[in-house]
Interface confidence: low
């Protein structure tokens, strides 16, 4: 048998892993598509993405709303050319997050 | 021109985002493959699993050590025989991680 | 508070190689996106920038001086040293040290080398 | 490598009065990335280069707003509305957009 603590514990876990904004390291180069004789560095940076479980397989994660933030990051063009430039890149941060359908349902259907 | 105290936010950041051993949600069933008869909920769970960042593109971030840790689940069958049951499922957790090549280098390569 | 400080000799002799310690605080080499170059200015000329290295070891060198220079770093010591061939007497200059950002912001107060038998 | 040519050599100014030093580069100093990295520095006797004004126009902290810096492309200016005693040295405009980086020849400036 099982009791209310185990049932709290099991239930904590379920709520920590449940479809939420979670910090996460993105590839700004990747992010910006930006040319390949352009990189940045640090090359990667922390914002939240939506990330986590949802109750059915037919529901997906996704972003409901989006915040851009502004990171400061170092543009180096291959072969270098100058000093390393600090530009601002601003990189899409996840405040809002919903399970839903994976693609547009029929209405009918 | 950029001062020492923005280099030091920018050192920080690129710290965080480095690989390492990062919490994650990883789905149960999809883990530990099993049959589409049995289902366990909470279907998700949190463990620390390799992710961030590395310096080079060739690098990956894979795991250099892993631990066992056991979570208490509830295992259903469909159709339902019987009372869902309280069992331990052991979920890998990684507790090193390294920026290794993607594939085996060549030895003269 | 940034401060760097150039040490080496004063008088070397042509054909000898001269060996110059940049010795900084205020900051890291170890930092991201730090860089510790040189540059020089013989008597009453213009400056010449001549070598950088960054955080991250890598180096670059003015194509011009590339053959005769190398640049290291100690970060644990806070120093980097500028190593340069060949001296003749046309190398007679003060080398500053500078922490390179964009533009030149800090630098060391010079130290006057002179190239002479 | 980018020739930054300064004008004139020697510039004696009387206190009180404006004065201009003209610096021309070889190439055009927009980088790739839009910025325009050409700087001015003063050296006064005996000391090192001190940052006056950084891209193009941007005067550095604590520089006094006498000094302001003018131009695009190739041709660039630095201007002091009033000259005082303490603005003598040697001013050098310099560029940071092309490796190897490159300083002009200097423009000294002293009181007539």
């Known amino acids: 048998f099982y009791d209310i603590e185990t049932l709290k514990v099991i239930d904590e876990e379920w709520q920590r892993t449940q479809c939420s904004p979670r910090e996460t390291c993105v590839e700004v180069a990747s992010e910006l598509g930006k040319s390949t004789n352009t990189f940045f560095k640090p090359p990667c940076v922390n914002v939240f993405r939506c990330g986590g479980c949802c109750n059915e397989e037919s529901l997906i994660c996704m972003n409901t709303s989006t915040s851009y933030i502004s990171k400061q990051l170092f543009e180096i063009s291959v072969p270098l050319t100058s000093v390393p430039e600090l530009v601002p890149v601003k990189v899409a941060n996840h405040t809002g997050c919903k399970c839903l359908p994976t693609a547009p349902r029929h209405p009918y259907s | 021109f950029y001062d020492i105290e923005t280099l030091k936010v920018i050192d920080e950041e690129w710290q965080r985002t480095q690989c390492s051993p990062r919490e994650t949600c990883v789905e149960v069933a999809s883990e530990l493959g099993k049959s589409t008869n049995t289902f366990f909920k909470p279907p998700c769970v949190n463990v620390f699993r390799c992710g961030g960042c590395c310096n080079e593109e060739s690098l990956i971030c894979m795991n250099t050590s892993t631990s066992y840790i056991s979570k208490q689940l509830f295992e259903i069958s469909v159709p339902l025989t019987s009372v869902p049951e309280l069992v331990p499922v052991k979920v890998a957790n990684h507790t090193g991680c390294k920026c290794l090549p993607t594939a085996p280098r060549h030895p003269y390569s | 508070q940034v401060t760097l400080k150039e040490s080496g000799p004063a008088l070397v002799k042509p054909t000898q190689t001269l060996t110059l310690t940049c010795t900084f605080s205020g900051f890291s080499l170890s930092t991201y996106g730090m860089g510790v170059g040189w540059i020089r200015q013989p008597p009453g000329k213009a400056l010449e920038w001549l070598a950088n290295i960054w955080w991250n070891d890598d180096k670059y060198y003015n194509p011009v001086l590339r053959s005769r220079l190398t640049i290291s770093k100690d970060t644990s010591k806070n120093q980097v040293v500028l190593t340069m061939t060949n001296m003749d007497p046309v190398d007679t200059a003060t080398y500053y040290c500078?922490?390179?950002?964009?533009?030149?912001?800090?630098w060391g107060e010079g130290t006057l080398v002179t190239v002479s038998s | 490598d980018i020739v930054m040519t300064q004008t004139p050599l020697s510039l004696p100014v009387t206190p009180g009065e404006p004065a201009s030093i003209s610096c021309r580069s070889s190439?055009?100093?927009?980088?790739?990335?839009?910025?325009?990295?050409l700087h001015w520095y003063l050296q006064k006797p005996g000391q090192s280069p001190q940052l006056l004004i950084y891209?193009?126009?941007n005067r550095f902290s604590g520089v006094p707003d006498r000094f302001s810096g003018s131009g695009s492309g190739t041709d660039f200016t630095l201007k002091i509305s009033r000259v005082e005693a303490e603005d003598v040295g040697v001013y050098f405009c310099s560029q940071s957009t092309h490796v190897p980086w490159t300083f002009g020849g200097g423009t000294k400036v002293e009181i007539k």
């Open positions: 190439q055009s100093l927009v980088h790739i990335n839009g910025n325009t990295y």
């Open positions: 891209k193009v126009s």
């Open positions: 500078v922490q390179v950002t964009n533009p030149f912001v800090f």
